[in-house]
Interface confidence: medium
């Protein structure tokens, strides 16, 4: 497993290959939007710090009936050490800020790209 330097995670950290696959899936979502992603559904914003994967899953799992993000939800569940169900929230959510799923996915993508650019996963 690859260590995220300075990135305290409460569980297993995804290996480089798995994270690459997640990034590519997020790329596919952001680049191939023909209509508003998930019909413009809103989700809670999260702090992109420790426990990010679980927090991201907790936000996205509340979006139902959106096939475009189902694979992302499955991939995130593999990165989160505990079971996440709809309606579950951690302190990592910015509970006063909701954003569109499209913006959420892009923010997550850019953060993961930044980790790679900083040499965390080369």
């Amino acid at each position: 497993l690859t260590c995220l330097g300075g990135f305290a995670s409460p569980g297993p950290v995804p290996p480089s290959t798995a994270l690459r696959e997640l990034i590519e899936e997020l790329v596919n979502i952001t680049q191939n939007q023909k209509a508003p992603l998930c019909n413009g559904s809103m989700v809670w914003s999260i702090n992109l710090t420790a426990g990010m994967y679980c927090a991201a899953l907790e936000s996205l799992i509340n979006v139902s009936g959106c096939s475009a993000i189902e694979k992302t939800q499955r991939m995130l569940s593999g990165f989160c050490p505990h079971k996440v169900s709809a309606g579950q929230f951690s302190s990592l959510h910015v509970r006063d800020t909701k954003i569109e799923v499209a913006q959420f996915v892009k923010d997550l993508l850019l953060h993961l790209k930044k980790l790679f650019r900083e040499g965390q996963f080369n």
């Epitope: 690459r20 990034i23 590519e24 790329v27 952001t30 680049q31 191939n32 939007q33 499209a102 913006q103 892009k106 850019l110 790209k113 930044k114 790679f116 650019r117 080369n122």
Partner: antibody, heavy 122, light 108 residues
Framework: EVQLLESGGGLVQPGGSLRLSCAAS????????MSWVRQAPGKGLEWVSA????????YYADSVKGRFTISRDNSKNTLYLQMNSLRAEDTAVYYC???????????????WGQGTLVTVSS | SYVLTQPPSVSVAPGQTARITCGGN??????VHWYQQKPGQAPVLVVY???DRPSGIPERFSGSNSGNTATLTISRVEAGDEADYYC???????????FGGGTKLTVL
């Protein structure tokens, strides 16, 4: 320190051929996509072609597809652009550029060579 | 194919703020990079991933991207900022890199 050094430019007649080279140093060449970008005199930047780190995927602008071929030799840390059936409108400074990430659809170019001038004229 | 539209020129007095726009259909869904090019020189990346700055680029340079417009903002403009500026994205529908037409920044 990242360095990109283009060579191979010069004067060629319409219909002729030319091969540009770009010698790279200061980074793990095979880990990054590379690209050629050109600039006609007094005009803006125009993307020409790109190639993945492994060389397995190539991309071309419509204006050069079928005439230009991009390739790379990772053992020599060198990028190439074979230009055939050259036209007057191909006259430009050709820049070699290093992509900032492994995922093609996230490409920005963080390092550029100084360029080599290609003049197509009879 | 995807088109990025930039104003041909922007003029600003020293010390003021320059804003250079880059328009594109739903560009907010794409990742935008900005380059500075001075006469006779190669382009230099000044903002990547919509709003991040490479090391060595002054904090005066910043970027934003939402809706149909990405913006490069240069605060406290200096004479040395006079250059051409280009925005760039990847267009997944064509598998092409796309550059804007460029904006000439003139410092009055």
């Amino acid at each position: 320190e990242v360095q990109l050094l283009e060579s191979g430019g010069g004067l060629v007649q319409p219909g002729g051929s030319l091969r540009l080279s770009c010698a790279a140093s200061g980074f793990t060449f095979s880990s990054y996509a590379m690209s050629w970008v050109r600039q006609a005199p007094g005009k803006g930047l125009e993307w020409v072609s790109a190639i993945s780190g492994s060389g397995g995927s190539t991309y071309y602008a419509d204006s050069v597809k079928g005439r230009f071929t991009i390739s790379r030799d990772n053992s020599k840390n060198t990028l190439y652009l074979q230009m055939n059936s050259l036209r007057a409108e191909d006259t430009a400074v050709y820049y070699c550029a290093k992509a900032d990430f492994w995922s093609g659809t996230l490409w920005g170019f963080d390092y550029w060579g100084q360029g080599t001038l290609v003049t197509v004229s009879s | 194919s995807y088109v990025l539209t930039q104003p041909p020129s922007v003029s600003v007095a020293p010390g003021q703020t320059a804003r250079i726009t880059c328009g594109g259909n739903n560009i907010g869904n794409k990742i935008v990079h900005w380059y500075q090019q001075k006469p006779g020189q190669a382009p230099v990346l000044v903002v990547y991933d919509d709003s991040d700055r490479p090391s060595g680029i002054p904090e005066r340079f910043s970027g934003s991207n939402s809706g149909n417009t990405a913006t490069l903002t240069i605060s406290r403009v200096e004479a040395g900022d006079e250059a051409d500026y280009y925005c760039q994205v990847w267009d997944s529908s064509s598998d092409h890199v796309v550059f804007g037409g460029g904006t000439k920044l003139t410092v009055l």
